[in-house]
């Protein structure tokens, strides 16, 4: 007797109706920028305050007939999904609605900007608890809308947006493409991406996670007790806004970076059938379906990390791609990936006082991606140690020599176009876990971090015969911070982290032949923080 | 989620610093840029968000808007300032002819200008 979507976001060992407390999210205010709403609907009556903000364009067409229930349809449903008494995620959250979409569901970038400004001014005039802003709308890529979202996020507001319903790369739309915004794609009851007519949910690296977005039962503006099923990435975003409200109510001091990491951490992993996405987008699209955390108290003891993909570099010879972490996150490792296999590796470098991950395309390559591993590591002091290409045949190596610093990631980058297939693989000497080893013609970069109680270990998985994919995962209680391939295997396309698993991809086996250099070794660096664990035990 | 995405159209209009002899001409070498939606049916030409440089104060935003109106009027164009932004981004929303873009891009403090566009319920 509970809608499928509420069941889906509830941790398996809880009954959804018992787990979702009637006051869940009560310390949080959720702003909804959408159509007008029917605020006296039973689901939301008394919990949604309609502000006097309205900035909408005229409806199209001379024969358009304004019907109140149609004008309110989208916004009422979403308000119900966020905080509805019966079908809502955060049943205790209070909401404020701003009208930025007209009766046809259309608005403008400028109207949305003015709405965001209104929220910021309200926040300054009357500071309340944590704020979540739900933007269940999308337009074409907009520099100004993304900039406004960035400013609001940096003022401590959590913004959640729809990825878009265009069955396209979410990076081509705003505010979905704004890095500071939590961008949500839609899945159905079978955990498959939602199809909407000929289109469907957007996808790609600009999507943070997915959430239920098909056949979502919620408040209907047709009558004060009516319900209706609606579908779309707006509905998915509303679920995440509700989950965010629940999390922030339990831990009001959470930063945006902490909240995003928790949303990712508590999501259901690898349940989406990636075949639905275009082939080139599968690796970039997170296979995550949002869920509530298994308990309402904090998970501060965990070392949280996420993977951030860059935009594609483009095919020019000297093209590079840059992946960045959020301001509150530490870049703990950097890797690269190229579908053609032609790349010149990656390096961590300082940019504006912060480390970024830069990947380099090679001559004849179709382009590369940089992949950053971004983690929450309080009181961390991280630096990059670089060893230039070695003359010796043993290869290049670099280690963390500072006292108390541990190795969190290895990168290698080379100037030569091809490291050559004739050179044998270089293996790491045993018993030296704090060391990165690379090809003698490559410069090697070690990410070395000092943080209270931080400990890391290296885990390898080698396969002698050629394989398209080699993986190695960190065990329970450890978090993957670094992912790389042992050098010497020239057919490696790159390495990247998927949740807690390091994935090393190779060229199609049939084209490489099974020579000795078919051997592929995936190297994972797994870390944990004893300090965070102790701190959370003391709190409990 | 960078600004590098390919489908995003950017028009860079070069400055001709001798025109208008502005008292507060932009620093040498900086070029304000014009942006518009890559999806043509979603464009709303005639309304523009003029975004000013980060540290611009409200009074400077209002002054820049008035200056644009005055210079447009001298050329026989009517403009309407629909909103002055402050709190999140400095700038203003203006209803004007696209013919004035080159002029607007040369105004002091201007970082970039974006043509308004549609957003849709998802």
């Amino acid at each position: 007797s509970i809608p499928w979507n509420l069941e889906r976001i509830t941790p398996p060992r809880y009954r959804a109706d018992e787990y979702q407390p009637p006051d869940g999210g009560s310390l949080v205010e959720v702003y909804l920028l959408d159509t007008s709403i029917q605020s006296d609907h039973r689901e939301i009556e008394g919990r949604v305050m309609v502000t006097d903000f309205e900035n909408v364009p005229e409806e199209d067409g001379t024969r358009f007939h304004r019907q109140a229930s149609k004008c309110d349809s989208h916004g009422t449903h979403l308000a119900g999904v966020v905080s509805g008494r019966d079908a809502g995620v955060a049943k205790g959250a209070s909401m404020r609605s701003l009208r930025v979409l007209n009766c046809q569901g259309k608005g403008t970038v400028s109207g949305t900007l003015i709405g965001l400004e209104f929220i910021r001014k309200s926040q300054l005039v009357q500071p309340v608890g944590p704020l979540v802003v739900l933007l269940p709308l999308a337009g074409g890529y907009s520099r100004v809308l993304n900039a406004a979202c960035q400013r609001l996020a940096r003022a401590g507001v959590v913004l959640v947006t729809a990825a878009g319903n265009f069955r396209d790369d979410a990076c081509l739309y705003s505010p979905a493409s704004a890095p500071e915004v939590i961008t949500v794609g839609a899945t159905n009851a079978q955990d498959q991406p939602v199809t909407l007519g000929t289109l469907g949910t957007n996808f790609g690296r600009c999507v943070d996670l997915f959430a239920p977005g098909e056949d979502i039962i919620g408040a209907s503006s047709d009558c004060s007790t009516c319900f209706v099923s609606q579908s779309g990435t707006s509905q998915a975003a509303a679920h995440v806004a509700g989950i965010a409200a629940m999390m922030l109510s339990a831990e009001p001091e959470l930063t945006l970076a902490e909240l995003r990491q928790r949303l990712i951490h508590f999501s259901a992993k690898d349940v989406i059938n990636e075949a639905w996405f275009p082939e080139d987008q599968r690796v970039l699209t997170p296979n995550l379906v949002a869920a509530l955390p298994p308990s309402t108290h904090g998970a501060g003891w965990q070392l949280f990390c996420r993977t951030v993909w860059s935009a594609h570099s483009g095919p020019t010879r000297m093209a590079t791609a840059v992946a960045r972490c959020a301001p509150d996150e530490e870049l703990l490792s950097c890797s690269s990936f190229s579908r053609s296999g032609k790349r010149r590796g990656e390096r961590m470098e300082a940019q504006g006082g912060k480390l970024v991950c830069r990947a380099h395309n090679a001559f004849g390559g179709e382009g590369v991606y940089a992949i950053a591993r971004c983690c929450l590591l309080p009181q961390a002091n991280c630096s990059v140690h670089t060893a230039p290409p070695a003359e010796a045949s043993m290869g290049t190596r670099v280690h963390c020599h500072q006292q108390g610093h541990v190795l969190t990631g290895c990168s290698s980058h080379w100037e030569v176009e091809d490291l050559g297939t004739h050179k044998p693989p270089v293996l790491r000497p045993r018993g030296q876990p704090n060391q990165c080893v690379g090809h003698r013609e490559a410069s090697i970069h070690a990410s070395c971090c000092h943080a209270p109680g931080l400990e890391c270990k290296v885990k390898e998985h080698g396969i002698p015969a050629p394989q398209e994919q080699v993986t190695v995962a960190c065990e329970e209680g450890w978090t993957l911070t670094g992912c790389s391939a042992l050098p010497g295997t020239s057919h490696v396309l790159g390495a990247y982290a998927v949740d807690n698993t390091c994935v090393v991809r190779s060229r199609d086996v049939s084209t490489t032949g099974s020579t000795s250099e078919g051997a592929v070794t995936a190297v994972a660096i797994c870390c944990r923080s004893r300090h965070l664990a102790q701190a959370s035990q003391e709190l409990q | 989620q960078e600004d590098e995405d390919g489908d995003y159209e950017e028009l860079v209009l070069a400055l001709r610093s001798e025109e208008d002899g502005l008292a507060e001409a932009p620093e040498h070498g900086t070029t304000a840029t014009f942006h518009r939606c890559a999806k043509d049916p979603w464009r709303l030409p005639g309304t523009y968000v003029v975004v000013l440089k980060e540290e611009t104060h409200l009074s400077q935003s209002e002054r820049t808007a008035r200056r644009l109106q005055a210079q447009a009027a001298r050329r026989g164009y009517l403009t309407k300032i629909l909103h002055v932004f402050h709190g999140l981004l400095p700038g203003f929303l203006v209803k004007m002819s696209g013919d004035l873009l080159e002029l607007a891009l040369k105004l002091p403090h201007v970082d970039y200008i974006e043509e308004d566009s549609s957003v849709f319920a998802q």
């Epitope: 007797s1 019966d86 039962i217 047709d222 | -």
Partner: antibody, heavy 126, light 106 residues
């Protein structure tokens, strides 16, 4: 099958508080599919909806009675209750409790009242 | 508040005859209207919901029609057990009931 039974005093003095309880048998009150409502009918007159509650304790009331009504739920006893304060002779009526489909679970049926209790007459008199 | 006006207040008919009851809303209730039957000393029973759908176990002689502000309950051929009071109820905006129509034996 599901049955509802109203109970409470049949006589209440003016300005006092009317208190009634509805006991649900043959099914659990704990379901998102239903609200549990109170409806009254003054002698020889029509029906008037008073208010409803779900098992989580979320209430909604008739705007004209809102200031005087409190509905509560006790899931452990499978009961819900009505309190109507500051009563007058105009509150004399047969009070019914009824199940109302919430509409959240489409399979549970349409969003209307039924089944009903058999009703209890409450007279307000000094 | 949406006011529902039922007419006639009383309808005197013989068994086997056709009964037509009217319910008019003060503003549109779309199709969110139900009909209940109440016999003396009993609780109301749902007959028709959402203007035209028969509730479970209700005989086919009962039918509902209308939308917006004007609704009709028709009993095609009155049976002895059909003589009772009939109420309409809307849920477009909260819940209100009509004043009732009494169908009595002529």
């Amino acid at each position: 099958q599901l049955q509802l039974q109203e109970s409470g005093p049949g006589l209440v003095k003016p300005s006092e508080t009317l208190s009634l309880t509805c006991t649900v048998s043959g099914g659990s009150i704990r379901s998102s599919a239903y609200y549990w409502g109170w409806i009254r009918q003054p002698p020889g007159k029509g029906l008037e909806w008073i208010g409803s509650i779900n098992y989580r304790g979320s209430t909604y009331y008739n705007p004209s009675l809102k200031s005087r009504v409190t509905i509560s739920v006790d899931t452990s006893k499978n009961q819900f209750s009505l309190k109507l304060s500051s009563v007058t002779a105009a509150d004399t009526a047969v009070y019914y409790c009824a199940r109302e489909n919430s509409g959240v679970v489409p399979a549970a049926g349409p969003n209307w009242f039924g089944p009903w209790g058999q009703g209890t007459l409450v007279t307000v008199s000094s | 508040e949406i006011v529902l006006t039922q007419s006639p207040a009383t309808l005197s008919l013989s068994p086997g005859e056709r009964a037509t009851l009217s319910c008019r809303a003060s503003q549109s209730v779309s199709s969110y209207l139900a009909w209940y039957q109440q016999k003396p000393g009993q609780a109301p029973r749902l007959l028709i919901y959402d203007a035209s759908n028969r509730a479970t176990g209700i005989p086919a002689r009962f039918s509902g029609s209308g939308s917006g502000t004007d609704f009709t309950l028709t009993i095609s051929s009155l049976e002895p057990e059909d003589f009772a009071v009939y109420y309409c109820q809307q849920r477009r905006n909260w819940f209100t009931f009509g004043g009732g129509t009494k169908v009595e034996i002529k």
